[in-house]
Amino acid sequence: KNLKSPQKVEVDIIDDNFILRWNRSDESVGNVTFSFDYQKTGMDNWIKLSGCQNITSTKCNFSSLKLNVYEEIKLRIRAEKENTSSWYEVDSFTPFRKAQIGPPEVHLEAEDKAIVIHISPGTKDSVMWALDGLSFTYSLVIWKNSSGVEERIENIYSRHKIYKLSPETTYCLKVKAALLTSWKIGVYSPVHCIKTTVENELPPPENIEVSVQNQNYVLKWDYTYANMTFQVQWLHAFLKRNPGNHLYKWKQIPDCENVKTTQCVFPQNVFQKGIYLLRVQASDGNNTSFWSEEIKFDTEIQAFLLPPVFNIRSLSDSFHIYIGAPKQSGNTPVIQDYPLIYEIIFWENTSNAERKIIEKKTDVTVPNLKPLTVYCVKARAHTMDEKLNKSSVFSDAVCEKTKPGNTSK
């Protein structure tokens, strides 16, 4: 009886794992083995595919074959018993194009209200992704084990920290990789779960802001308790993208080590041009807080995003605010040639109730004010570009009294 060729050959490539699967053509014939040949582009001869010779099952692995993953190859298969079937040719393919990204490795660390996620490619030193190692981005799905309500986080790198979680709570997550340059989305990792710790005695510092004063950076933060010491550390932001390395060498800012105030001042030349991460930690001598949320600090933007300067024209029921370019030392205006949006906060001098206006224009009306009342105004600028999502610090507050009634015209 003539042997039939195997059919429906599927090539599955995940990272550097090359798997072939096929269907037997004739289930009734026993003791049949299968063999593959391959052919590279531009070659006439067929070569035996090592790892896929005389296979008794309907699956084989040819990962050991050192292929150029960007080069097209062709495969053929036949069945063998006493005689052999005709060859069945598989459509030619390029391994890189066919390859899927495998599940990444995930390492979790817990704090009381945060989880640190370290992500590594599933295959270390992968040949398939050798040229793309630094281009991987990741996305994750996270949920409270008790509720199952999922939150998706996109476009993260090999280290990511999720904040504002609940203490003593189990969170579960799964991660997948993507190579956006090649339109490839990977396979999810297994689900990993971790329980956040009991609430720490000392909370981390909050609301970290960087501003520029003369030739210095001023770093400010808020803290709940008095009589604390603080330290500040920085890290090059690009190091979060380093796929294999999970040793993050955070550096101390010398002028911000063991400071007793909720701010520190350090020279601009501490940082070369670049994007950095900053974090602050509090200590009372016995206990230490976890690190604050990491803020992104771009020296380029920081250097030129100064608080706006404004003038107020007071009427009885409104202020007209005219926003001008901020002044550098030496009173020269700073030219800011990128679109800004202005946030204006105003409040009655005798009250803490703040109201907010967001405006793109540089002349703004603050309506619905009471006559003969002192109002205070402060403003800050935000970049409108999402990638350079940056804010200046607030200007100093300016307080003015509204005019008597009937002067609004």
Epitope: L108, E109, H118, T197, E201, L247
Partner: antibody, heavy 118, light 107 residues
């Protein structure tokens, strides 16, 4: 294969200084922290300090501030520990270790025995 | 500095048993705890990092657990070659600290 080879045993007089070395192979010390740990006979482990060989930044446990000085030479892939004003309390085995991923010490040297005696 | 306390200096167990070595931190260190094994006359060997992660080559009978201030190293199906001293260490802050060690004796 990652290995940390430490210098041989030292016998030194009280008040003197001693310098111990730790030569790494199988990895570049610039990519890691290099740590030093002290262990006295039949006692526990004490972390002395660490260096980032990439820029020379050091950090010491308060107890060893002024006593220990850690340096690194990236050209020879070597970290060193200098101990000054030695007393009998400094008699111990000193280990170098690599500060690896997630800050844990993943590889250790074989240890160097330092005996302070007149 | 964070103090790491291993309250049991000695523990006695038999081959095939399950034993748990405990370690308590004086303050919350998250999950930044490592465990080391030191056999007589040898240098320490890393077993566990980040409280629960086993180094490659470490037998899966070694398991780490815990977070915050309380940590445990469990050895299931104890073997004679597990006769050693076990140290915990916090790697949460720059000034790492070790526990005093727990010596495991095999009956």
């Amino acid at each position: 294969e990652v290995q940390l080879q430490q210098s041989g045993a030292k016998l030194v007089k009280p008040g003197a200084s001693v310098k111990l070395s730790c030569t790494a192979s199988g990895f570049n010390i610039k990519d890691y922290y290099m740590c030093w740990v002290k262990q006295r006979t039949e006692q526990g482990l004490e972390w002395i300090g660490r260096i980032d060989p990439e820029d020379g930044e050091t950090k010491y446990a308060p107890k060893f501030q002024g006593k220990a000085t850690i340096t690194a030479d990236t050209s020879s892939n070597t970290a060193s520990l200098q101990l000054s004003s030695l007393t009998s309390e400094d008699t111990a085995v000193y280990y170098c270790a690599r500060g690896g991923n997630y800050y844990a010490m993943d590889y250790w040297g074989q240890g160097t025995s330092v005996t302070v005696s007149s | 500095d964070t103090v790491m306390t291993q309250s049991q200096k000695f523990m006695s167990t038999s081959v095939g048993d399950r034993v748990s070595v405990t370690c308590k931190a004086s303050q919350n260190v998250g999950t930044n705890v490592a465990w080391y094994q030191q056999k007589p006359g040898q240098s320490p060997k890393a077993l566990i990092y980040s409280a629960t992660y086993r180094y490659s080559g470490v037998p899966d009978r070694f398991t780490g657990s815990g977070s915050g201030t309380d940590f445990t190293l469990t050895i299931s199906n104890v073997q004679s070659e597990d006769l050693a001293e076990y140290f915990c260490q916090q790697h949460n802050s720059y000034s790492y600290t070790f526990g005093g060690g727990t010596k495991l004796e095999i009956k």
